[in-house]
């Protein structure tokens, strides 16, 4: 089958600080030296890009400074962390992997990770 398989967990619960982490693993059909990883959010039929990073195999994964994502890579596995999440950000987050170089190009799309975010209860005022 001329395709790239991408695996990611089905469900992740964000921490009380609005941080969610998950592993995105891909089975590379070729020996890529340049890989692009994108996190997409799917709401209804709309798909939007959350963050993206390109890395050279063996080097570290670097997102833009203003990105809400951070990550590390090890072989064909990427550990992704999304920060600053609120309850309204609950949804399906898809890991997309592209083998950019050398040819041929391959596209891999995971089934998505449902991230649940619960806003923390505000601390009650204390009376002394």
């Amino acid at each position: 089958c001329k395709a790239m398989h991408v695996a990611q967990p089905a469900v992740v619960l964000a921490s009380s600080r609005g941080i969610a982490s998950f592993v995105c693993e891909y089975a590379s059909p070729g020996k890529a030296t340049e890989v692009r990883v994108t996190v997409l959010r799917q709401a209804d039929s709309q798909v939007t890009e959350v963050c993206a990073a390109t890395y050279m195999m063996g080097n570290e994964l670097t997102f833009l400074d203003d990105s809400i994502c951070t990550g590390t890579s090890s072989g064909n596995q990427v550990n992704l962390t999304i920060q600053g999440l609120r309850a309204m950000d609950t949804g399906l987050y898809i890991c997309k992997v592209e083998l950019m170089y050398p040819p041929p190009y391959y596209l891999g799309i995971g089934n998505g990770t449902q991230i649940y975010v619960i806003d923390p209860e505000p601390c009650p005022d204390s009376d002394f």
Epitope: A3, E34, R36, K96, Y105
Partner: antibody, heavy 118, light 108 residues
Framework: QVQLVESGGGVVQPGRSLRLSCAAS????????MHWVRQAPGKGLEWVAV????????YYADSVKGRFTISRDNSKNTLDLQMNSLRAEDTAVYYC???????????WGQGTLVTVSS | EIVLTQSPGTLSLSPGERATLSCRAS???????LAWYQQKPGQAPRLLIY???SRATGIPDRFSGSGSGTDFTLTISRLEPEDFAVYYC?????????FGQGTKVEIK
Amino acid sequence: QVQLVESGGGVVQPGRSLRLSCAASGFTFSSYGMHWVRQAPGKGLEWVAVIWYDGRNKYYADSVKGRFTISRDNSKNTLDLQMNSLRAEDTAVYYCARNQPLGSFDYWGQGTLVTVSS
Amino acid sequence: EIVLTQSPGTLSLSPGERATLSCRASQSVSSSYLAWYQQKPGQAPRLLIYGASSRATGIPDRFSGSGSGTDFTLTISRLEPEDFAVYYCQHYGSSPWTFGQGTKVEIK
């Protein structure tokens, strides 16, 4: 709204060159791969070339490799196709198309006709 | 290169009838990377279905896609006058991007 508008088509003699452009608007251009697809008169669709994101990675169909060059200017939201050593079989309507996040081509321009004839 | 073969070449049907279009791949492909497009004369192609079965934005639910492996199908449940056009399948999971040769749905 997303808009793609091609220009630069026309009649050209075999062996000559032509440059097509595609002006994009209504979306963050640098976040998308962009393709050229062509359609010879009365025929089906043929993928020609793609350029990714920052413009470093490009792929071409075997039929145009070494003759066509795809490029983009993210500051101007434009996509170009430089076509050299044109042949009669390059006669077609050329479309630019946006690569949607999940991989298919979700928006297309109206097309520009290139006729290679002596 | 993945070769896509569409059948039939031409489908002659009446409005209100059901249309079933086939797309066969030369080797197994993931359903995540199979799309269908509609093209009317003098117009650009329009994305109908991606991921073999997901309808693109604004596409009516009379259009549906299915299939896996090497065999994929586009079904139009009840043909409307505006559905008479040429339909193309496409594989986009790896380079080169390929299209089928098209199926023309014409009025009987």
